[in-house]
């Protein structure tokens, strides 16, 4: 009788991560008696994937009923494939022996390739806020994709950015890959409503590229401009002085009035008005009793914005 052959008809198969992979194997004879085992890889370091006789292989099922007397189909199905399952799988026939079975013949092997989608890109910005005209860095990361080829683009409000550096790791062969990119963005006063977008395209994506976003509202600090003005006299001996705090972001702001360097009143900004560009305006007023002063009064509006050093604007009130 012709010697047993182990036939693995598929030289290579490709499977999407999360799906099942069927590895086909048939033998041409029932002789010699002995089990079939599946391995990933060859040589002494090979990994046992399935043993017909013993062991627990929760992700592996046989395609045929191996208990049937004349069964010659030893194909297996591996469920929930991940990139880590990639490799060459060998169907190996053993001859019954004592105490151990002896390897008799191996199939030619089936290379399993796994395609995996990139994870949703995560964009992160600087730890501390920065002011307009400063350059800040944003990073974008996506993981777990295969094959290695991937494209990454950066956008600010729909306009493609060019100042970025991207790395795909590892450089050599791997079961899956990660991408890391850093983009530099110059902030402007109008960026409170702006968005930075990282877009990743890969062969496995049936839809549009995956996008990760960062709102510049979490990165930018727009310092206020101050204007102190004296209003017309409201009543005899009383002057109304206002401090206009304009175009600031974020909202956190504390204002202190000083009369000739002495603290008159401190208040925290509330009932702000929002500008179209996302910045805020606020106005504080101080009623000064002129009759309490014999000399001219120096009024100072001092603003501490978002924990930054105070800025101030003064106004000299003439007492005549």
């Amino acid at each position: 009788e012709e010697e047993l052959q182990v036939i693995q008809p598929d030289k290579s198969i490709s499977v999407a991560a999360g799906e099942s992979a069927t590895l086909h194997c048939t033998v041409t004879s029932l002789i010699p008696v002995g089990p079939i085992q599946w391995f990933r890889g060859a040589g002494p370091g090979r990994e046992l994937i399935y043993n017909q006789k013993e062991g627990h292989f929760p992700r592996v099922t046989t395609v045929s009923d191996l208990t049937k007397r004349n069964n010659m189909d030893f194909s297996i199905r591996i469920s929930n494939i991940t990139p880590a399952d990639a490799g060459t799988y060998y169907c190996v026939k053993f001859r019954k022996g004592s105490p151990d079975h002896v390897e008799f013949k191996s199939g030619a092997g089936t290379e399993l390739s796994v395609r995996a989608k990139p994870s949703a890109p995560v964009v992160s910005g600087p730890a501390a806020r920065a002011t307009p005209q400063h350059t800040v860095s944003f990073t974008c990361e996506s993981h777990g994709f295969s094959p290695r080829d991937i494209t990454l683009k950066w956008f600010k409000n729909g306009n493609e950015l060019s100042d970025f550096q991207t790395n795909v790791d590892p450089a050599g062969d791997s079961v899956s890959y990660s991408i890391h990119s850093t983009a530099k963005v110059v902030l402007t006063r109008e960026d409170v409503h702006s968005q930075v977008i990282c877009e990743v395209a890969h062969v496995t994506l049936q839809g549009d590229p995956l996008r990760g976003t960062a709102n510049l509202s979490e990165t930018i600090r727009v310092p206020p401009t101050l204007e102190v003005t004296q209003q017309p006299v409201r009543a005899e001996n009383q002057v109304n002085v206002t401090c206009q705090v304009r175009k600031f972001y974020p909202q956190r702001l504390q204002l202190t009035w000083l009369e000739n360097g002495n603290v008159s009143r401190t208040e925290t900004a509330s009932t702000l008005t929002e500008n179209k560009d996302g910045t805020y305006n606020w106005m504080s007023w101080l009623l000064v009793n002129v009759s309490a002063h014999r000399d001219d009064v120096k009024l100072t509006c001092q603003v501490e914005h978002d924990g930054q050093p105070a800025v101030s604007k003064s106004h000299d009130l003439k007492v005549s």
Epitope: K11, S14, A16, T151, A201, Q206
Partner: antibody
Framework: VQLVESGGRLGQPGTPLTLSCTVS????????MGWFRQAPGKGLEYIGI?????SPYYASWVNGRFTISKTSTTMDLKMNSLRSEDTATYFC?????????????WGPGTLVTVSS | DIQMTQSPSSLSASVGDRVTITCRAS??????LAWYQQKPGKAPKLLIY???FLYSGVPSRFSGSGSGTDFTLTISSLQPEDFATYYC???????????FGQGTKVEIK
């Protein structure tokens, strides 16, 4: 799983024409779909694709002449102004489940003839 | 745009012959290459994807190889039903566009 093109006919130069691709056995919201054409006795030519979310992408030569759109069960190819060189069999196809680099299911095609 | 050059444009062969068709890309497309078979008046049929993976239901006499710019479709033993036109098709992962070769017509000798 099946694709069937329709709408092919004799059209006059300068007139618009819309072709449809009706799908069954799968959801258009899960796959990229493509349009291709083949002039008589010539090779296959890529026109464009539409992503699972409905964004169209076109071959560089299309230059706004064609528009791809879709509903839940059909994908359309609108030809804005027919030219004689648009005479061809038009095919729709679906990309494979593993990725967008190949097309594993094709419709039988619909013939468009442009002549005055 | 990437150009795909297929050769030969036609060939004559007999049943049982080994047939090889090549496809060359004008720039690297890694392994993003598919092969299709088309018969007159019919739609193309996918044979090979990712340069070397046999599509389900396709006979094992068809095989593909290559990566980068040079690719090969081999029919190990030509059968009567294999007389048809064969096309290669590339996908470029940066431009995300597709290009076909001009086709190879396999005729009966």
């Amino acid at each position: 799983v099946q694709l069937v093109e329709s709408g092919g006919r004799l059209g006059q130069p300068g007139t618009p024409l819309t072709l449809s691709c009706t799908v069954s056995g799968f959801s258009l919201s899960s796959y990229v779909m493509g349009w291709f054409r083949q002039a008589p006795g010539k090779g296959l030519e890529y026109i464009g694709i539409i992503s699972s979310s409905g964004s169209p992408y076109y071959a560089s030569w299309v230059n706004g002449r064609f528009t791809i759109s879709k509903t839940s069960t059909t994908m359309d190819l609108k030809m804005n102004s027919l030219r004689s060189e648009d005479t061809a069999t038009y095919f729709c196809a679906r990309v494979g489940p593993l990725g967008v680099d190949y097309f594993n299911i094709w419709g039988p095609g619909t013939l468009v003839t442009v002549s005055s | 745009d990437i150009q795909m050059t297929q050769s030969p444009s036609s060939l004559s062969a007999s049943v049982g012959d080994r047939v090889t068709i090549t496809c060359r890309a004008s720039q690297s497309i890694n392994s993003y290459l598919a092969w299709y078979q088309q018969k007159p008046g019919k739609a193309p049929k996918l044979l090979i994807y990712s340069a070397s993976f046999l599509y389900s239901g396709v006979p094992s006499r068809f095989s593909g190889s290559g990566s980068g710019t040079d690719f090969t479709l081999t029919i190990s033993s030509l059968q009567p039903e294999d007389f048809a036109t064969y096309y290669c098709q590339s996908w470029h992962y940066i431009s995300r566009s597709y290009t076909f070769g001009q086709g190879t017509k396999v005729e009966i000798k």
